[in-house]
Amino acid sequence: WELTILHTNDVHSRLEQTSEDSSKCVNASRCMGGVARLFTKVQQIRRAEPNVLLLDAGDQYQGTIWFTVYKGAEVAHFMNALRYDAMALGNHEFDNGVEGLIEPLLKEAKFPILSANIKAKGPLASQISGLYLPYKVLPVGDEVVGIVGYTSKETPFLSNPGTNLVFEDEITALQPEVDKLKTLNVNKIIALGHSGFETDKLIAQKVRGVDVVVGGHSNTFLYTGNPPSKEVPAGKYPFIVTSDDGRKVPVVQAYAFGKYLGYLKIEFDERGNVISSHGNPILLNSSIPEDPSIKADINKWRIKLDNYSTQELGKTIVYLDGSSQSCRFRECNMGNLICDAMINNNLRHADEMFWNHVSMCILNGGGIRSPIDERNNGTITWENLAAVLPFGGTFDLVQLKGSTLKKAFEHSVHRYGQSTGEFLQVGGIHVVYDLSRKPGDRVVKLDVLCTKCRVPSYDPLKMDEIYKVILPNFLANGGDGFQMIKDELLRHDSGDQDINVVSTYISKMKVIYPAVEGRIK
């Protein structure tokens, strides 16, 4: 019996087609992805093959103005329109709190939404009961397939799930649910979830009875053969893991942003054992036409976005200096504003020991593309912010050793004075450079804001200590020559859309007046 699994993950609000790098589509003839194009390909496969499941491994939420405006209603609407069979909860599904998940998505989705390792407690338990499930048995033709969901246990550090959801260890939570499916005579089981490729592989290895793992979170690109676009494969598709009980378990992921549709064909024997598995992600490029009906619906929903982008978010009473003449040479108040917004967006998970889990921000000055003039009645709009941060990136959370941070700051000024983009703007950091010294030895003082303290203060950076830092995904991926970050980071979790982070902060503050205050000397 053959099953076709179509899968997406980390779509992050890319409802419209995008450019090849998943930013705003400029030249339509070279654009990719989007739900209208995805629908065309999905329908093509559904028509050609008998047993097809369309699955999503989480993080539909967060990433473009679509999510900012529609807050998840767009996810439910278009996933329903594409007729998804199941979805696993990702960490970003909690970005607007539990209410922001329940109302727009859980109550509106026609398909089951899954996670076995999230347990509700207190008053939330009854409110959310039945709205998401640990598993679902799906009929496919004359057979049944069990889908069991999981979500990153780091979600409380990455999003806003509140205090009434407990995120258990994935493997510990999955095993009893898989065992339950086995007792229901379900012998074909897919683990669908959002914890990253390393955890996906562990699930394949450790959870008895899981036949296939469909993952997300790490934006992993797997491919067999010559890859069709810019993404470099992290391994073959499917990636085969030998389980502890000796089975060959295929593990798949489909990069991110709706650029690819994962396509996996699995052959099962009559006892539900995987006999063979093969496939590849399908690049959703312009050779696949956008479905006209879905496209028309997208255009209808788009109208509200255009109206939103010109509305006032808040006011500034000072000039927001985002000029390259400032931000690539010295501390600039636009850099301070953005870093303060980045930290504010990550205020969560305080306890008796820590006032917050992260206090530091770094931001390449070259990523700040425009100033905002306060003389326009002080008005700040989404449109203004899109000019400052035009690349459609995210502000991510990484863990780095102090020694890596020191290298990053040396790199920041290794060729100072040439108006290059690597000059770092900061938050929660005080750095002193001596530019008379030779490159690689110019950082003379580097103090960082403590997190394990009741009164935050600046302490000298310790080389062997592990620090959490918020930074643009561009830097986490080694951009602007920050190879040491990419090579030495100990953990990387994708965060929220950059413009959204700053716009939320400005809306919250109402009136802003960031200063140049001696963070960089």
């Epitope: 329109a81 799906l138 009929p139 496919v140 028309a296």
Partner: antibody, heavy 121, light 107 residues
Framework: QVQLVESGGGVVQPGRSLRLSCAAS????????MHWVRQAPGKGLEWVAV????????YYPDSVKGRFTISRDNSKNTLYLQMNSLRAEDTAVYYC??????????????WGQGTMVTVSS | DIQMTQSPSSLSASVGDRVTITCRAS??????LAWYQQKPEKAPKSLIY???SLQSGVPSRFSGSGSGTDFTLTISSLQPEDFATYYC?????????FGGGTKVEIK
């Protein structure tokens, strides 16, 4: 082979009740949404009810809502339509039809031969 | 509710003719449209689903096209056994609705 056989039709007075059955064979009944569709004499097709594969959801058009109830017994591979408060305009051939395997609306790939219901005093 | 309008309501054609029947939805239904054939005193038979996919066992002279609101059923070369009534049906949303039917008669 795949087959649907309806039964239970007949002549009934207005205001009375009737229960139709549909016996399924040749496929995994519990995996499919099942529908009732009717056709008044000399008229077109009208959808009457659906019950999803697991019985979790049922949908009806306004014309029968509150009067007709669809149900299924997966252990007996049987679909039912309980029709109460029958009216003259309910007179039709009632077909049982197989839908899809999910919770989305679907088309009908297999049809029964139909059973005639006549509502007349 | 989504209204389905079929045209023509009847047509006369000869064996070998190319026949086209149209179906219009009152609102967009993407490609969630099916076509059925019904002969007198018989149950309907599924021909096409998802606007253009041929049900297994249906001759290739039948084809469907369209998306959104406008759909077409084409019989490329009418055969004697094709004289029947044809119905379209939307399954975009409940309540499911049928077109009024097109009766194809012998000229």
């Amino acid at each position: 082979q795949v087959q649907l056989v309806e039964s239970g039709g007949g002549v009934v007075q207005p205001g009375r009740s009737l229960r139709l059955s549909c016996a399924a064979s040749g496929f995994t009944f519990s995996n499919y949404g099942m529908h009732w569709v009717r056709q008044a004499p000399g008229k077109g097709l009208e959808w009457v009810a659906v019950i999803l594969y697991d019985g979790s959801n049922k949908y009806y058009p306004d014309s029968v809502k509150g009067r007709f109830t669809i149900s299924r017994d997966n252990s007996k591979n049987t679909l039912y339509l309980q029709m109460n408060s029958l009216r003259a305009e309910d007179t039709a051939v009632y077909y049982c039809a197989r839908g899809g395997s999910s919770w989305y609306p679907d088309s009908f790939d297999i049809w029964g031969q139909g059973t005639m219901v006549t509502v007349s005093s | 509710d989504i209204q389905m309008t079929q045209s023509p309501s009847s047509l006369s054609a000869s064996v070998g003719d190319r026949v086209t029947i149209t179906c219009r939805a009152s609102q967009g239904i993407s490609s969630w449209l099916a076509w059925y054939q019904q002969k007198p005193e018989k149950a309907p038979k599924s021909l096409i689903y998802a606007a253009s996919s041929l049900q297994s066992g249906v001759p290739s002279r039948f084809s469907g096209s369209g998306s959104g609101t406008d759909f077409t059923l084409t019989i490329s070369s009418l055969q004697p056994e094709d004289f029947a009534t044809y119905y379209c049906q939307q399954y975009n949303s409940y309540p499911l609705t049928f077109g009024g039917g097109t009766k194809v008669e012998i000229k």
